[in-house]
Interface confidence: medium
């Protein structure tokens, strides 16, 4: 009997049916970041390319001022990758002296802002200690999951240090969301 | 009024509706790779299992000669994980002498080939420096994002060094795509 | 002729159409783990929050006793991130003596249990060597892919060492699945 409620379409189907092609969707790609003032203990937000190259927004999903604006309530899959790159972390010098220490780290957070809530909500976080010795380093952090969002919610990607973000290629650092 | 255009199905709905179960989909899993000649500065492509174990292709999504062939235009979610493994990187020997150096690295690229374009398009890249000291190492790189593809586009996964790919288990190294 | 079978909905459409909003979906978030007895050579399963905060289950997708229960056959996208954290791995001490060795490691496995099968099936594995020197460390492992599941299948997340899992924040360690 499973699936019986989804009868051939000449019959009544009460749940609203959707053409998949008209669902809100966006894939944003990295651009060179302008370091901006941000509050202490608050990670800066990345800004993004939304229409050139691989980037697009469609079906009322809009990008403005570092935010993806959710046009319709529903369950969304949200993802981002940020590639970081840096010189040898200071951690290594302390390490070589044989003392344990608080490691350097890189962090990505996908954050939801709801105007009616005073505080942003952290949806996803990827955080990694970086303790490299003797060479430059580079590595990605990838995140992705499904969340129930409301019309008007705004999504952004925050990072622990904007100066470590690899902005050189659109395939290395990106951010996207689509209604399921 | 949102969703009003998706009326009960005895009414006219102009957007083409789809049964989700007949959308093109594929999940490919790793097999032992045969190192092949490839052009200098061009990463070799992996080949894949497409029907045994967890692997499948369905609804006209076909796999042939290292490529997933896109049978229908639309927005696809594309993903891959490659697990790499290796012996101590040479980098470590240089490092121990206390000299910074260009690190060894591992890279995965998901590439789109369009016959009418002379150059492949890199959709996704995960790249990581590897500077390990004194032991074998292993680690995955995961990628996933949504892209607008055209009928006839071909997708492949390229890696920086095919000999470092862990081909031993289908759950460690894989590649997939599905129409949203 | 592509898509011709998906005619305006006053015509006959034989494939069962679905409202997207009523598909089985779940996003589970980390809770503090109670170390439990587990068989040697078998990784322990994590348990999860399923209704507080960002966590939810809907449309007959139920969570019980560490398992997500699949209520309907079909193709599902399944994902998880586990953030691990630990003290300096022992590996580093051995390394400093200049001897190559088997590295410490962290592993996440998404496992499918089918009652009619004697053995669980490993769907996804992320495994990483950890050889840190002189500091605490933390890092995520992310996994996600599409699988064909049957009604009654059960999904769980297993880890190599439950004591290393960062259970402090719902955005750091999570597990989800949704019917495509």
């Amino acid at each position: 009997l499973k699936g019986q409620e989804f009868a051939p379409s000449h019959q009544q189907v009460y749940a609203p049916l959707r053409a998949d092609g008209d669902k809100p969707r966006a894939h944003l790609t990295v651009v060179r970041q302008t370091p901006t003032q941000h509050f202490k203990n608050q990670f800066p937000a990345l800004h993004w390319e939304h229409e050139l190259g691989l980037a697009f927004t469609k079906n009322r999903m809009n990008y403005t001022n570092k935010f993806l604006l959710i046009p319709e309530s529903g369950d969304y899959f949200i993802y981002s990758q940020v590639t970081f790159r840096g010189m040898t972390s200071e951690c290594s010098e302390i390490r070589q002296a044989g003392r344990p220490n608080k490691p350097d780290s890189i962090t990505v957070v996908i954050t939801k802002v709801t105007d009616s809530y005073p505080e942003p909500t952290q949806l996803l976080m990827g955080t990694k200690s970086v303790c490299e010795v003797g060479s430059n380093w580079f590595q990605p952090i990838y995140l992705g999951a499904m969340f129930s969002l409301q019309e008007g919610d705004k999504l952004m990607v925050n990072v622990s240090d904007i100066s470590l973000v690899d902005y050189t290629k659109e395939d290395k650092t990106f951010f996207g969301a689509f209604l399921l | 009024l949102k969703g009003q255009e998706f009326a009960p199905s005895h009414q006219q709905v102009y957007a083409p509706l789809r049964a989700d179960g007949d959308k093109p989909r594929a999940h490919l899993t790793v097999v032992r790779q045969t190192p092949t000649q490839h052009f200098k500065n061009q990463f070799p492509a992996l080949h894949w299992e497409h029907e045994l174990g967890l692997a499948f292709t369905k609804n006209r999504m076909n796999y042939t000669n290292k490529f997933l062939l896109i049978p229908e235009s639309g927005d696809y979610f594309i993903y891959s994980q490659v697990t790499f493994r290796g012996m101590t990187s040479e980098c470590s020997e240089i490092r121990q002498a206390g000299r910074p150096n260009k690190p060894d690295s591992i890279t995965v690229v998901i590439t789109k080939v369009t016959d009418s374009y002379p150059e492949p398009t890199q959709l996704l890249m995960g790249t990581k420096s590897v500077c390990e000291v004194g032991s074998n190492w292993f680690q995955p790189i995961y990628l996933g994002a949504m892209f607008s593809l055209q009928e006839g586009d071909k997708l492949m996964v390229n890696v920086s060094d095919i000999s470092l790919v862990d081909y031993t288990k289908e759950d460690k190294t894989f590649f997939g795509a599905f129409l949203l | 002729l592509k898509g011709q079978e998906f005619a305006p909905s006053h015509q006959q459409v034989y494939a069962p159409l679905r409202a997207d909003g009523d598909k089985p979906r779940a996003h589970l978030t980390v809770v503090r783990q109670t170390p439990t007895q587990h068989f040697k050579n078998q990784f322990p399963a994590l348990h999860w929050e399923h209704e507080l905060g960002l966590a939810f289950t809907k449309n007959r997708m139920n969570y019980t006793n560490k398992f997500l229960l699949i209520p309907e056959s079909g193709d599902y996208f399944i994902y998880s991130q586990v953030t691990f954290r630990g003290m300096t791995s022992e590996c580093s001490e051995i390394r400093q003596a200049g001897r190559p060795n088997k590295p410490d490691s962290i592993t996440v496995v998404i496992t499918k249990v089918t009652d009619s099968y004697p053995e669980p099936t490993q769907l996804l594995m992320g495994t990483k060597s950890v050889c840190e020197v002189g500091s605490n460390w933390f890092q995520p492992i992310y996994l996600g892919a599409m699988f064909s599941l049957q009604e009654g299948d059960k999904l769980m997340v297993n880890v190599s060492d439950i004591s290393l899992v960062d259970y402090t924040k719902e955005d750091k360690t999570f597990f989800g699945a949704f019917l495509l």
Partner: antibody, heavy 121, light 107 residues
């Protein structure tokens, strides 16, 4: 077909050097590693070192460090192993063997026929 | 270096017998172990890689198992051409090392 053909038997005096060649055919030489393994009469196999035929990087067993040199000539699809300061205990059959992977060794899938090296005064 | 100890060092068996050879590593080597067959005057031949994967072209009567420190090579039904010496080899860390060998003789 895929094969490795080694040079012929050698007789050397103590203190001399020997250079054994290994010609590859039937596959892309530069896509694999080449290892050298020896076997003294009645003894177990002993790994000496390897070369990444693509980039020429080498790794040697500590036991032979300073005495062994592994090289390759990509134009001739040939690898070479030179062992210097020979002593009587170096009397053995020397094998080249293809490593499927140049990094994480999943064993040696193709072997040469072996070259007998005798060290005798 | 990682030591590999094979047992027995020799065994006598008849055609059709099930034969088991073990290899113990002095420290954990994950699944990084291979098995070879060597006949007198010939080069070794790869049978099993990654502890349990059968090399292409090798008869299915050969199988490998184990992980960590204890490994087994099994010949399910010994054939006349299987009388030879068998070696295990670890490729987990440098230097790569071999076991002492197990000679399988005709009873």
């Amino acid at each position: 077909q895929v094969q490795l053909v080694q040079s012929g038997a050698e007789v050397k005096k103590p203190g001399a050097s020997v250079k054994v060649s290994c010609k590859a055919s039937g596959y892309t030489f530069t896509s694999y590693a080449m290892h050298w393994v020896r076997q003294a009469p009645g003894q177990r196999l002993e790994w000496m070192g390897w070369i990444n035929a693509g980039n020429g990087n080498t790794k040697y067993s500590q036991k032979f460090q300073g005495r062994v040199t592994i090289t390759r000539d990509t134009s001739a699809s040939t690898a070479y192993m030179e062992l210097s300061s020979l002593r009587s205990e170096d009397t053995a059959v020397y094998y080249c063997a293809r490593g499927y992977s140049s990094a994480w060794f999943d064993a040696f899938d193709i072997w040469g026929q072996g070259t007998m090296v005798t060290v005798s005064s | 270096a990682i030591q590999l100890t094979q047992s027995p060092s020799s065994l006598s068996a008849s055609v059709g017998d099930r034969v088991t050879i073990t290899c113990r590593a002095s420290q954990g080597i994950s699944s990084a172990l291979a098995w070879y067959q060597q006949k007198p005057g010939k080069a070794p031949k790869l049978l099993i890689y990654d502890a349990s994967s059968l090399e292409s072209g090798v008869p299915s009567r050969f199988s490998g198992s184990g992980s960590g420190t204890d490994f087994t090579l099994t010949i399910s039904s010994l054939q006349p051409e299987d009388f030879a010496t068998y070696y295990c080899q670890q490729f987990n860390s440098y230097p790569l090392t071999f076991g002492g060998g197990t000679k399988v003789e005709i009873k």
